[in-house]
Amino acid sequence: TQNKALPENVKYGIVLDAGSSHTSLYIYKWPAEKENDTGVVHQVEECRVKGPGISKFVQKVNEIGIYLTDCMERAREVIPRSQHQETPVYLGATAGMRLLRMESEELADRVLDVVERSLSNYPFDFQGARIITGQEEGAYGWITINYLLGKFSQKTRWFSIVPYETNNQETFGALDLGGASTQVTFVPQNQTIESPDNALQFRLYGKDYNVYTHSFLCYGKDQALWQKLAKDIQVASNEILRDPCFHPGYKKVVNVSDLYKTPCTKRFEMTLPFQQFEIQGIGNYQQCHQSILELFNTSYCPYSQCAFNGIFLPPLQGDFGAFSAFYFVMKFLNLTSEKVSQEKVTEMMKKFCAQPWEEIKTSYAGVKEKYLSEYCFSGTYILSLLLQGYHFTADSWEHIHFIGKIQGSDAGWTLGYMLNLTNMIPAEQPLSTPLSHSTYV
C-alpha cells in the first residue's frame, strides 16, 4: 500500500503592521501540538501593502478596502482553505495613527472603523484593529527577538542555532526605528527603573523579567526629518534651505502646509513669509549631525540619567538587536557587518553624504528617488540617536547587531503581539515531554 502523508497539524495567524509609512501583512505558522514551546512559531510570508500608511487615508477612507485587497487575497492563497475560519487576524497601528488620534480622535476612529469593516469581510477570524501603545510596541519587539533567539528556552546548548547567539540566557535589548517613533527596550542590570511609565514586569516560561522600555513619538526617521526641516526653516533668511543632510546638487520644493501638517512640528511652527521653500543639499555629515542634535533636549533630566527630553534611561546593558529602519537603512549603506566599528560607520557616512546627487542617482538607479535622497539624513540620524540619544559609545557599538530576520522571521513587534494575543507564551515553563529530542545533538 502507498504511504499517504498525514495532514499537517498546523495553525496559522496573521498580523498586519499598520505603520506610519506603509502596512505589512505577516503570516505565521506553528505546529498545533507544540503551541507552548518556545521558538516554534515562524513566519511563512510577508506581504507589503502597496501605498502609504493607513493614517494617510483619512480623506479617502473609501479606498481602504481596495488598498488591503492584494495582501489579504495573498493570505487566502497561502493559508489552506480548511484553516481560514480558525486563523486569527490582528491589525496593530503604530505611531502614524497615534499622531492622527492626537489631531482628531474622530478621524482616527473613522479610519480604524473602515479598516475593520474591510477586514471583517474575509473568511478569517478577525480579531480587530487597534492603535497599540508605544510601550506595547517596545515590549512586543523585545519579546519577538528574544523568542526567535531562543532566549526564553531553558535548554542550554553547546552549539549555536542562530546568529548573534551568545550562548547564554541573557536577553537582548531591542532597538526599533519606525517612520514616526522609535523604541528602546532592555533588561537593565540590577538598576531600579526610576520612572514607573518605563517599567514592565513579565513572567515568561517560569522566569521573571524587569524590563525598561520607552517609545519616543515623533523621533521615527520620517518625523525626525520633518522636525529638523521645521527647526531649520525658522532661521532661513529666505525660501531656500541649504541642508547638510542632503547630497550636493539635490533640490526639492516643500510646501509649508505639509511641513506643519504633523503634530511633531508644532513646537517649531511660525508664520513664514512664503508658502513653499526649496531644499538645496550641501552634503555635510558633521553639520547634519549637529543639526540633528538640536532635536534632542539634553539640558533637563529629573532622574539619575536620561536619554533626551527628560526621559529616564538606565545604563545600557548587554547586546542589542536593532531592527526595522535601523536595519533597512544600515543595510542599504552596507554598514550592518559586525566587523564595522562606529568610527568606520561615521567615516563611511561622511563620504556617502558628500557624494553629489547626480552620482548617487547613477550608482543606485533602481532605487526610488524619494527614498534614495533621504539615506544621508537617515544614516546620520541613526548615528546621532544611538550615540547621543541612547548613549552608546565607540566601545559599546559592537554590542549593537543590525538584524533584519532571525530564523527567517522578521524582527519587529508583530510576532510578539500575536504570541501574546494567542496566549502562546506561558508564564510558567511547560512540562517537558519525555525524551525530548533537544536532549540529543
Partner: antibody, heavy 121, light 107 residues
C-alpha cells in the same frame, strides 16, 4: 427628529429574492452606518450586515456572505437590503438600525419599525 | 465570532422588586457592550451602551456594569412598563452579536 421608515411586508416564494428599503427622514443620513438585523418569529436578534452610505462600504456576517447585498442611495437617504435564494428559515422581521458612531460605537441608537418577510410556497 | 450568552432565559419578578440580568461573552469585549429592551410587536430600544452608560431618555432605575466577559443589567425597581425581553449586544468586534435574550415577566 430622525426616523427610519421601512418598506412594507412581503410574501416571497422559496428561491426568489427580496429587497427591503429603509429611508431616513428628518436628519442626516450619509455619515451614519446603517445595519440590518433580523428576528425570526419567537427568536432573538441576528446581525446581517452594515453599510456606511457616505462611502458605500458594506460588510456582512459570514453566514449571509454571497446571499445578502446591502446598498445605499445618498440622494434619497435610503438604504437597501437584498436577500437572495430565499428559504423558509428566512421568514423574519427585518430591521434597519442606525449605528451610533464609528469604530467602538457600533450599537444601535435608532431602529426602523421592521419589515415582515414571509417565505412560503 | 463572539458568542453572547444571557441568563436566565426567563426571570419572574414582582413589580417594585430588583431584577438582575446577566450576559457573558466568549472572549473579552472590554466595555463594548449594549443592552436593549424589546416589547412584543415593537423594535428594540437602546438602554445602555459602553457597558454602563445610559442612553438618552432612559430612567435611572436601569444600570449596567461589568467589563471583559461578564456583564450585568440591573433594574432597581421594576415598573409595569419594564416587563419585556432584554438583549445584550457586543460592539467590540465584527460580526456584531446579540445574546439570546432574557424575558422579564410578572411574578
Amino acid at each position: 427628529q430622525v426616523q427610519l421608515v421601512q418598506s412594507g411586508a412581503e410574501v416571497k416564494k422559496p428561491g426568489s429574492s427580496v429587497k427591503v428599503s429603509c429611508k431616513a427622514s428628518g436628519g442626516t443620513f450619509a455619515s451614519y452606518a446603517i445595519s440590518w438585523v433580523r428576528q425570526a418569529p419567537g427568536q432573538g436578534l441576528e446581525w446581517m450586515g452594515s453599510i456606511i452610505p457616505e462611502f458605500g462600504i458594506a460588510n456582512y456576517a459570514q453566514k449571509f456572505q454571497g446571499r445578502v447585498t446591502i446598498t445605499a442611495d445618498e440622494s434619497t437617504s435610503t438604504a437597501y437590503m437584498e436577500l437572495s435564494s430565499l428559504r423558509s428559515e428566512d421568514t423574519a422581521v427585518y430591521y434597519c438600525a442606525r449605528e451610533a458612531g464609528y469604530y467602538r460605537y457600533r450599537y444601535f441608537d435608532l431602529w426602523g419599525r421592521g419589515t415582515l418577510v414571509t417565505v412560503s410556497s | 465570532e463572539i458568542v453572547m450568552t444571557q441568563s436566565p432565559a426567563t426571570l419572574s419578578v414582582s413589580p417594585g422588586e430588583r431584577a438582575t440580568l446577566s450576559c457573558r461573552a466568549s472572549q473579552s469585549v472590554s466595555s463594548n457592550l449594549a443592552w436593549y429592551q424589546q416589547k412584543p410587536g415593537q423594535a428594540p430600544r437602546l438602554l445602555i451602551y459602553g457597558a454602563s452608560t445610559r442612553a438618552t431618555g432612559i430612567p435611572a432605575r436601569f444600570s449596567g456594569s461589568g467589563s471583559g466577559t461578564e456583564f450585568t443589567l440591573t433594574i432597581s425597581s421594576l415598573q409595569s412598563e419594564d416587563f419585556a425581553v432584554y438583549y445584550c449586544q457586543q460592539h467590540a468586534l465584527w460580526p456584531l452579536t446579540f445574546g439570546g435574550g432574557t424575558k422579564v415577566e410578572i411574578k
